[in-house]
Amino acid sequence: FKVATLYSLYVCPEGQNVTLTCRFFGPVDKGHDVTFYKTWYRSSRGEVQTCSERRPIRNLTFQDLHLHHGGHQAANTSHDLAQRHGLESASDHHGNFSITMRNLTLLDSGLYCCLVVEIRHHHSEHRVHGAMELQVQTGKDAPSSCVAYPSSSQESENITAA
């Protein structure tokens, strides 16, 4: 399977909400013993590999934000912890999964990574990730609402196999 980042850059004004999205697609083993973890974290553009470093998003770790479910089931983080930090991660039946960040500040600017791990019998079989940049702007140069810039075809299949 693969993960596509629909947009490689989001430019938003301070105070806005933004939803960063990844799409998970390709052949999915629908065996009863196969499940998926999907999560989000911040990172930096490493020289060797993007998304190798994991940093929290608003003090929440990738474990706090993870979704666990079978195949293309829908799921979302309902726990208070994420919502108290103005965050919500969600996943739909079509392979889209996202993180919504409310009331953006300049501190939210940076590189964000989505990660999908295929699990069989409690063990990691495959893992893929996608990366996107968020720029939060203030002042007269800031857009009035969020603008998302599409990924190039090469970037949009940002694949890291296990």
């Epitope: 990738f62 706090d64 666990h68 409690h122 063990h123 990691s124 296990a162």
Partner: antibody, heavy 123, light 112 residues
């Protein structure tokens, strides 16, 4: 510190069901899995299965598949293991254990264990 | 199911002497992802099991460095470089590579 506290000893009749609880504290409940292992008197250890608290997904040893149910209550950080159609061979100490995994959700060990719950099946 | 066979089943040791426990699996326990999920647990008398070693050779935090694990494929060994009185109990190997996960029958270590 990490603690798994299990419910007290039970005596059941053959054919009945038993529900053992395991209350977790000292860590974030949804960041780890919970496994169940049993030990018959004077015998070795036998793995029964596990549950993923964040989703409720569980996977069981085929030997117990038709008789075991693992559930969780995230509001109280408690996992339950129910075993039905009890027979004398089910007399054992039942342990819950925390399943640790790495940054890619890959299990590597049962790192902390409960104190055990003795279930006696006798007519 | 994978059968884990330990030897010896009983191991009398003099304090300060080394000890070695063998664990053999009925088939390879190398997982398809390349990892080998072989663990060692110690159950002291009247207590719950406790983790010693995971993924063949990694010592769990707080486990003394006199404990070491090694092996590959189907043959694994737990070594105690210098046995102490507190090491008495039953040692179990455990494979978590193939469902159902299975324990060895246990090796009882006692002080001579």
């Amino acid at each position: 510190q990490v603690q798994l506290v299990q419910s007290g000893a039970e005596v059941k009749k053959p054919g009945a069901s038993v529900k053992v609880s395991c209350k977790a504290s000292g860590y974030t409940f949804t960041h780890y899995t919970i496994h169940w292992v049993r030990q018959a008197p004077g015998q070795g250890l036998e793995w029964m299965g596990y549950i993923i608290p964040s989703s409720g997904y569980s996977e069981y040893n085929q030997k117990f598949k038709d008789r075991v149910t693992m559930t969780r209550d995230t509001s109280t950080s408690t996992v339950y293991m129910e075993l039905s159609s009890l027979r004398s061979e089910d007399t054992a100490v039942y342990y819950c254990a925390r399943g640790a995994y790495d940054d890619y959700y890959d299990y590597y060990a049962m790192d902390y264990w409960g104190q055990g719950t003795l279930v006696t099946v006798s007519s | 199911d994978i059968v884990m066979t330990q030897s010896p089943l009983s191991l009398p040791v003099t304090p300060g002497e080394p000890a070695s426990i063998s664990c053999r699996s009925s088939q390879t326990i190398v997982h398809s992802n390349g990892n080998t999920y072989l663990e060692w647990y110690l159950q002291k008398p009247g207590q719950s099991p406790q983790l010693l070693i995971y993924k063949v050779s990694n010592r769990f935090s707080g486990v003394p460095d006199r404990f070491s694990g090694s092996g590959s494929g189907t043959d694994f060994t737990l070594k105690i470089s210098r046995v102490e009185a507190e090491d008495v109990g039953v040692y179990y190997c455990f494979q978590a590579s193939h469902v159902p996960w299975t324990f060895g029958q246990g090796t009882k270590l006692e002080i001579k």
